[in-house]
């Protein structure tokens, strides 16, 4: 006799208004008496509709929450599993049931903001900027909302960057406990003449950090050939262990690059009689603290002042 189990009931994808953080929820299946004591596990698959691959999780819960790109639709499917303990060693699962979440198509795509860019300066404040949609009326203005886990609800930007009295960006500071988790942004717009398409963005703040450049550079030469360069990590909240550095060394007309995770470097002079010996350095967050990052600006150039030419007394 074939053992059967029903799929979960009332599977749905809900938007609680958190700008892309959605709830997938369901109710337990109708279970025949024989399996009342069995633990049910649910296999949930979900994806944005343009994605090739499904994300799969197994849960004993009746709800699962995750972040999505609300610029695109979402689809999910779920089925019930009975463990082999309950079925005499055979793996039993229900048929799949499906649910989808369609995005709002209010406003044409041309009204949506363009070139959204966000930088988390020195791990201290976030600046996002955008350009207006391709074809919008002159009365169009945009509003930015953001949310991350820890906030009760989505918040609106309180400090807009403006151009011609229009919002073209936002500065956010005091973002407590906001890194190493998804940070959701929605920029929507308003116009009396047409609806404006919303734009959604999601990233993690530690991956878009642009540090300040290193400072207090110093260069010295020992034994006339050993170059010693050192610098200080810039001030601010980024721990020294989180930096990686790129150094450009210039010896007369030749320059070359080097890299290190320390804030000093030793190397040999290329030519004993070189007259010009300078370096400058930039930094970014390293792979131990983030998956990505933005290079700082270059520091000021520092040159060795110990050279004494043939004319020196």
């Amino acid at each position: 006799l074939e053992i059967k189990v029903n799929p979960p009931q009332d599977f749905e994808i809900l938007d609680p208004g958190l700008l892309g953080y959605l709830y997938l929820q369901w109710k337990p299946p109708v279970v025949i008496e024989k399996f009342k004591g069995c633990t049910l596990e649910y296999e949930l698959k979900y994806r944005n509709v343009d994605s090739d691959s499904w994300k799969t999780i197994i849960t004993r819960n009746l709800i699962y929450k995750d972040g999505f790109d609300l610029n695109k639709g979402i689809e999910g499917k779920i089925r019930t599993h009975l463990s082999e303990h309950c079925t005499n060693g055979s793996e039993v699962q229900s048929p799949w049931i499906e649910a989808s979440y369609g995005i709002s198509d209010e406003g044409s795509l041309e009204t949506k903001i363009q070139d959204m860019k966000c930088i988390y300066y020195n791990w201290q404040y976030l600046v996002c900027s955008w350009k207006p949609g391709k074809t919008v009326y002159s009365d169009t203005n945009y509003t930015m909302f953001f949310w991350y886990e820890g906030l009760d609800h989505a918040l609106q930007c309180a400090d807009y960057l403006q151009h011609d009295e229009k919002n073209v960006g936002c500065k956010l500071s005091n973002l407590d406990s906001s890194d190493y988790k998804d940070f959701f942004i929605c920029v929507n717009g308003s116009s009396k003449l047409e609806p404006i398409r919303s734009s959604y963005t999601v990233f993690q703040l530690q991956n878009i950090v642009k540090p300040l450049p290193p400072e207090f550079l110093h260069i010295s030469v020992e034994n006339s050939i050993d170059i010693r360069m050192k610098w200080s990590t810039p001030g601010g909240p980024i721990p020294p262990r989180c930096y990686t550095y790129e150094i450009v060394i210039r010896e007369d007309d030749i320059s070359w690059e080097s890299a290190t995770d320390k804030n000093d470097m030793k190397l040999k002079r290329r030519a004993n009689e070189s007259e010009d010996l300078c370096f400058f350095v930039r930094c970014k967050v390293n792979i131990y603290c983030a998956d990505d990052g933005i290079w700082s600006e270059w520091s000021e150039e520092e040159c060795w002042e110990g050279y004494t030419g043939p004319d020196s007394k």
Epitope: T39, E41, I58, T59, K65, S83, E84, H85, G89, E91
Partner: antibody
Framework: EVQLLESGGGLVQPGGSLRLSCAAS????????LNWVRQAPGKGLEWVSA????????FYADSVKGRFTISRDNSKNTLYLQMNSLRAEDTAVYYC??????WGAGAFDYWGQGTLVTVSS | DIQMTQSPSTLSASVGDRVTITCRAS??????LAWYQQKPGKAPKLLIY???SLESGVPSRFSGSGSGTEFTLTISSLQPDDFATYYC??????????FGQGTKVEIK
């Protein structure tokens, strides 16, 4: 008496491969989900992979996905972990563990004694 | 992923003491939580499953409580054999199965 006995550990160079085995006895093997859990020297426990009783469903931690493959031979009462493209951070004691009840993972009521995998050049 | 946070990391206690270890989940895991004991060089040993069910053969001085996101392992009267490292583990949702970072119970 339930017993799980791992073997196959050893020293391997980065980029190399190793196959761990876990021989089981004392329970209805095909009925129970099995997992691999590892512990780096001086560190905590890290779940690696799971397989359902029939072997039809497998699950992996992100850190090993695409490099490790879990499998089982229910006729031989043996669980396997094929480890490819090994890295220094895979160095650990690898335990096989039996799920108390559940389809893929759950509470682990029996553990093997562990086998040490060292990835070093 | 569900994060499991144990506290304290280290606990100094004496034989006969009542000892409590806390485990917090980053989201609700109902009662799908297990506690393990591990001694140096040995495999972990299951103590508690489903948050409060005592595994067969485990002394009754061990007990588990809690549901949702807050869980507790209590040793009512610490014995010499209980000095070890204790781990919590969630099995509500996976992959991945996640463990707490461990609590070392040492002699005061």
């Amino acid at each position: 008496e339930v017993q799980l006995l791992e073997s196959g550990g050893g020293l391997v160079q980065p980029g190399g491969s190793l196959r761990l085995s876990c021989a089981a006895s004392g329970f209805t093997f095909s009925r129970d989900a099995l997992n691999w859990v590892r512990q780096a020297p001086g560190k905590g426990l890290e779940w690696v992979s799971a397989i359902s009783g029939s072997g039809g469903s497998t699950f992996y931690a992100d850190s090993v996905k695409g490099r490790f493959t879990i499998s089982r031979d229910n006729s031989k009462n043996t669980l396997y972990l094929q480890m490819n493209s090994l890295r220094a951070e895979d160095t650990a004691v690898y335990y096989c563990a039996k799920v108390r009840y559940g389809w893929g993972a759950g509470a682990f009521d029996y553990w093997g004694q562990g086998t040490l995998v060292t990835v070093s050049s | 992923d569900i994060q499991m946070t144990q506290s304290p990391s280290t606990l100094s206690a004496s034989v006969g003491d009542r000892v409590t270890i806390t485990c917090r989940a980053s989201q609700s895991i109902s009662s799908w939580l297990a506690w393990y004991q591990q001694k140096p060089g040995k495999a972990p040993k299951l103590l508690i499953y489903d948050a409060s069910s005592l595994e067969s053969g485990v002394p009754s001085r061990f007990s588990g409580s809690g549901s949702g996101t807050e869980f507790t392992l209590t040793i009512s009267s610490l014995q010499p054999d209980d000095f070890a490292t204790y781990y919590c583990q969630q099995y509500d949702t996976y992959p991945p199965i996640t463990f707490g970072q461990g609590t070392k119970v040492e002699i005061k």
